[in-house]
């Protein structure tokens, strides 16, 4: 599987609003949501037979043509 964009950097934004214990603050939608799956299962380690998708927290080159770094508004992330 081809590598997707994962070079994300945070931007200045208001502090996350407090969530009830059963919820987590989603850094993209900026709302409290059900925490759901805790840490998506890691792809196979390097050296596996087929290239696995990487996760958002792993460094990667920019995907956009001419873009220095792909950016998503993720306050507090990275």
């Amino acid at each position: 599987m081809r590598r997707g964009p994962r070079s994300l950097r945070g931007r200045d934004a208001p502090a996350p609003t407090p969530c009830v214990p059963a919820e987590c603050f989603d850094l993209l939608v900026r709302h409290c949501v059900a925490c759901g799956l805790l840490r998506t299962p890691r792809p196979k380690p390097a050296g596996a037979s087929s290239p696995a998708p990487r996760t958002a927290l792993q460094p990667q080159e920019s995907v956009g043509a001419g873009a220095g770094e792909a950016a998503l508004p993720l306050p507090g992330l990275l």
């Epitope: 994962r6 989603d26 850094l27 949501v33 059900a34 759901g36 799956l37 998506t40 996760t55 958002a56």
Partner: nanobody, 121 residues
Framework: EVQLVESGGGVVQPGRSLRLTCAAS????????MYWIRQAPGKGLEWVSY????????YYADSVKGRFTISRDNSKNTLYLQMNSLRAEDTAVYYC??????????????WGQGTTVTVSS
């Protein structure tokens, strides 16, 4: 192995519709929130929509609100994005992305390979 495979992209005229599909495998899809995130040519990433594991919570970016509809079928491990009234500015690579949570926060997890949508007359 976690796998997300998007399909349904293509070239479409402004005002028309497309439906994107994301086939998920290798993890418990039914308990994972999911995002659609896009990247226009030469631009940064833009969050499009979010759906919770049970479809009870749905959010849209302002730029697509009222035009795009996110949905999922947990029995088929599939995520969808129905895109109506498409505009030239919707031209982008669309990625299906898992939601990962920890330490009281959620954020993008694993990304698919993307499917390209081109809106052009």
């Amino acid at each position: 192995e976690v796998q997300l495979v998007e399909s349904g992209g293509g070239v479409v005229q402004p005002g028309r519709s497309l439906r994107l599909t994301c086939a998920a495998s290798g993890f418990t899809f039914s308990t994972s929130g999911m995002y659609w995130i896009r990247q226009a040519p030469g631009k940064g990433l833009e969050w499009v929509s979010y759906i919770s594991s049970s479809s009870s919570t749905i959010y849209y970016a302002d730029s697509v609100k009222g035009r795009f509809t996110i949905s999922r079928d947990n029995s088929k491990n599939t995520l969808y994005l129905q895109m109506n009234s498409l505009r030239a500015e919707d031209t982008a690579v669309y990625y299906c992305v898992t939601q990962s949570c920890g330490a009281g926060k959620c954020y993008p997890g694993v990304w698919g390979q993307g499917t390209t949508v081109t809106v052009s007359s």
